[in-house]
């Protein structure tokens, strides 16, 4: 079967403070079974930005409809961006298990925050 690829097409995104940032992520396979999660940063200090189990994540919305069947678009929008949001965001596929285990990561999208226009 087709090997899963996680495509984050934007290497970087620049957003003015107070605006919304869209972080794109698509996958090429429904396998392995398991969830997608978004993180800022890598390693043990990474911060969970979105998954569908925990939360709420009041500033994060999914771009695709939540009732879309066989969804392969896991892009998110983060509202009211502040300088604290700057960093590299990773879209990561987990393999279902007890607990779920990280399977593959996208290449990451670096979010930079511009000063709010006066």
């Amino acid at each position: 079967e087709e090997e899963l690829q996680i495509i984050q097409p934007d290497k970087s995104v620049s957003v003015a403070a107070g605006e919304s940032a869209i972080l794109h992520c698509t996958i090429t396979s429904l396998f392995p079974v398991g969830p997608i999660q978004w993180f800022r940063g890598a390693g043990p200090a990474r911060v969970l930005i979105y998954n569908q189990r925990q939360g709420p994540f009041p500033r994060v919305t999914t771009v695709s409809e939540t009732t879309k069947r066989e969804n392969m678009d896991f892009s998110i929008s983060i509202s009211n961006i502040t300088p604290a949001d700057a960093g590299t965001y990773y879209c990561i596929k987990f393999r279902k298990g007890s607990p779920d285990t990280e399977f593959k990561s996208g290449a990451g999208t670096e979010l930079s925050v511009r000063a709010k226009p006066s």
């Epitope: 079967e1 429904l30 392995p32 079974v33 969830p35 393999r95």
Partner: antibody, heavy 120, light 108 residues
Framework: DVQLVESGGGVVRPGESLRLSCAAS????????MSWVRQAPGEGLEWVST??????YYADSVKGRFTISRDNSKNTLYLQMNSLRAEDTAVYYC???????????????WGLGTLVTVSS | EIVLTQSPATLSVSPGERVTFSCRAS??????IAWYQQKPGQAPRLLIY???SRDTGIPDRFSGSGSGTDFTLTISSLQSEDFGVYYC??????????FGGGTKVEIK
């Protein structure tokens, strides 16, 4: 049209083995997770097992005794059932999984089922 | 394991009546609930997924609602072909996928 056709059911004694098959057509079999769900006579539905690509999941009641597998070249799902018990007596349904949004799976197409009877 | 409790176990209804089925989860399952119809001697048929989305080809007299722990399936005007058993299923936390015990709809 999606079609799922189970076969391989029958009457066996406790401790014996049986292998169920499910022939799938009308969709791209290899890209979907597939499951087995059973229904004991006069009872409700009980999930048995699910397979993704090579990832497999089992109900506690069958773990270590049943093995789910698939042959994508033949569009066929299998359930190898060993050490069968009287409580495994049921109609076994093959079901195609569907995912929605960012969440888990439900079953959007079902076969007609095959009856497995375990009796001494 | 998430337990789904369906009530009532049996409903006696006349054609044309409005019918409501309840499914209660032992813990929060968000909107990750599907509903199935099973007629005697037949396989289950998907009616509703994501708590309220009708599957392709399902008549609009069927509707689902709820989130969290309490879910409802409603048939606005029962037709003769709607008799059978209705099951809810959660897919929020698995394995295992779990089903409710079912609600049987019979002719009054």
């Amino acid at each position: 049209d999606v079609q799922l056709v189970e076969s391989g059911g029958g009457v066996v004694r406790p401790g014996e083995s049986l292998r169920l098959s499910c022939a799938a057509s009308g969709f791209s079999f290899s890209i979907y997770a597939m499951s087995w769900v059973r229904q004991a006579p006069g009872e409700g539905l009980e999930w048995v097992s699910t397979i993704g690509a090579d990832d497999t999941y089992y109900a506690d009641s069958v773990k270590g005794r049943f093995t789910i597998s698939r042959d994508n070249s033949k569009n066929t799902l299998y359930l190898q059932m060993n050490s069968l018990r009287a409580e495994d007596t049921a109609v076994y349904y093959c079901a195609k999984d569907s995912t929605v949004g960012w969440s888990g799976d439900f079953f959007d197409y079902w076969g007609l089922g095959t009856l497995v009877t375990v009796s001494s | 394991e998430i337990v789904l409790t369906q009530s009532p176990a049996t409903l006696s209804v006349s054609p044309g009546e409005r019918v409501t089925f309840s499914c209660r989860a032992s813990q929060n399952v968000r909107s990750d609930i599907a509903w199935y119809q099973q007629k005697p001697g037949q396989a289950p048929r998907l009616l509703i997924y994501a708590a309220s989305s009708r599957d392709t080809g399902i008549p609009d007299r069927f509707s689902g609602s709820g989130s969290g722990t309490d879910f409802t399936l409603t048939i606005s005007s029962l037709q003769s072909e709607d008799f059978g058993v209705y099951y809810c299923q959660q897919y929020y936390d698995w394995p295992p996928f779990t089903f409710g015990g079912g609600t049987k709809v019979e002719i009054k």
